[in-house]
């Protein structure tokens, strides 16, 4: 059965963009104009997950490409990183759960709960050009807030 | 509060088209599903198919591929669908509906129907 | 597609009586289930989604569970402006799909 998607940019709660920053990459950093363009579009795909009142489980896959957003433990930590798929088998409505964020929606500000690592969260740095990681703090210095800007399919 | 109000009833001759809207007000369009659903007289509820007005994105049901276009204009908060190749168990209420883009809220807001009479 | 089984298809019951109406999903709809009320020459009725939960301003006398595949809309005293057609919706898998409906009748 088709999983139920729509294609979307993020941006933190300082409206820095998201771009590739190498093959496996993200990093956060302000755009303007026509650099607007670089702004990786994903495909946001709800799946099944955990039963919750407040958080919807979504994959997050760049579209067009065969890449995941997915949380695995390196060096015993837990860290976000880009993973390739074979196209053919993804996106799927039971998604593994390294590839499965609970989306948490207040005030119309996003944030996204590794279902992996609960109270882990998508993170930015303050500071421009940094990669986008896995963070385990929220409401400290780091960025755990982003707005969804909705992209023609 | 949120409101659909959908286009008035329409009468057909068999093989005509007709469209059908449904302006929507109250909420941010672009974040909700539309979704389209029919009624034949005396019968049950029957899912014709969906769009995401900010996404552009459409899925329909396989039954109605063919049958049923739907459409949105952003700039008028309104979706529309158009049947085509109009038959007799065509007649029906048509109804749209409202689904917030993550689908969690269920169909929650209803416009109040559009009769649509296939009839020679 | 998914086949959304309702039953019965049709109950009488009295004021204050206690009613349940099932619908049974031939295939695990992850919780996308939904309750709609529609009474004669009039829109449905979005009563409850996602099994259980109440849309606002419906009173609290409607319930929703689920066992299962099993599904069950209840009202536990039944008021006069309850007796219309009850129908499920499960919105997992295209093509969403309906139950067939229960009218629920004063006896």
């Known amino acids: 059965a088709p999983v139920r998607s729509l294609n979307c940019t993020l941006r933190d709660s300082q409206q820095k963009s998201l771009v590739m920053s190498g093959p496996y990459e993200l990093k956060a950093l302000h755009l303007q104009g026509q650099d607007m363009e670089q702004q990786v579009v994903f495909s946001m795909s709800f799946v099944q997950g955990e039963e919750s009142n407040d958080k919807i489980p979504v994959a997050l896959g760049l579209k067009e490409k065969n890449l995941y957003l997915s949380c695995v433990l390196k060096d015993d930590k837990p860290t976000l990183q880009l993973e390739s798929v074979d196209p053919k088998n993804y996106p799927k409505k039971k998604m593994e759960k390294r590839f499965v964020f609970n989306k948490i929606e207040i005030n119309n500000k996003l944030e996204f709960e590794s279902a992996q690592f609960p109270n882990w969260y998508i993170s930015t740095s303050q500071a421009e050009n940094m990669p986008v990681f896995l963070g385990g703090t929220k409401g400290g210095q780091d960025i755990t807030d982003f707005t969804m800007q909705f992209v023609s399919s | 509060q949120v409101q659909l109000v959908q286009s008035g009833a329409e009468v057909k001759k068999p093989g005509a088209s007709v469209k059908v809207s449904c302006k929507v007000s109250g909420y941010t369009f672009s974040r909700y599903w539309i979704e389209w659903v029919r009624q034949a007289p005396g019968k049950g509820l029957e899912w014709i198919g969906e769009?995401?007005?900010?996404?552009?994105?459409?899925n329909y049901n396989e039954k109605f591929k063919g049958k049923a276009t739907i459409t949105a204009d952003t700039s008028t908060d309104t979706a529309y669908m158009e049947l085509s190749s109009l038959r007799s168990e065509d007649t029906a209420v048509y109804y749209c509906?409202?689904?917030?883009?993550?689908?969690?809220?269920?169909?929650?807001?209803w416009g109040q129907g559009t009769l649509v009479t296939v009839s020679s | 597609d998914i086949q959304m089984t309702q039953s019965p298809s049709s109950l009488s019951a009295s004021v204050g009586d206690r009613v349940t109406i099932t619908c049974k999903a031939s295939?695990?709809?992850?919780?996308?289930l939904s309750w709609f009320q529609q009474k004669p020459g009039k829109a449905p009725k979005s009563l409850i989604y996602r099994v259980k939960r109440l849309v606002d301003g419906v009173p609290s006398r409607f319930s929703g569970s689920a066992s299962g595949t099993d599904y069950t809309l209840t009202i536990s005293s039944l008021q006069p402006e309850d007796f219309a057609t009850y129908y499920c919706l499960q919105y997992d898998e295209f093509p969403y799909t309906f139950g067939q409906g229960t009218k629920l009748e004063i006896k």
């Open positions: 509906s409202t689904i917030y883009y993550d689908y969690d809220q269920g169909f929650t807001y």
């Open positions: 295939q695990d709809i992850d919780r996308y």
């Open positions: 769009i995401l007005p900010g996404n552009v994105n459409i």
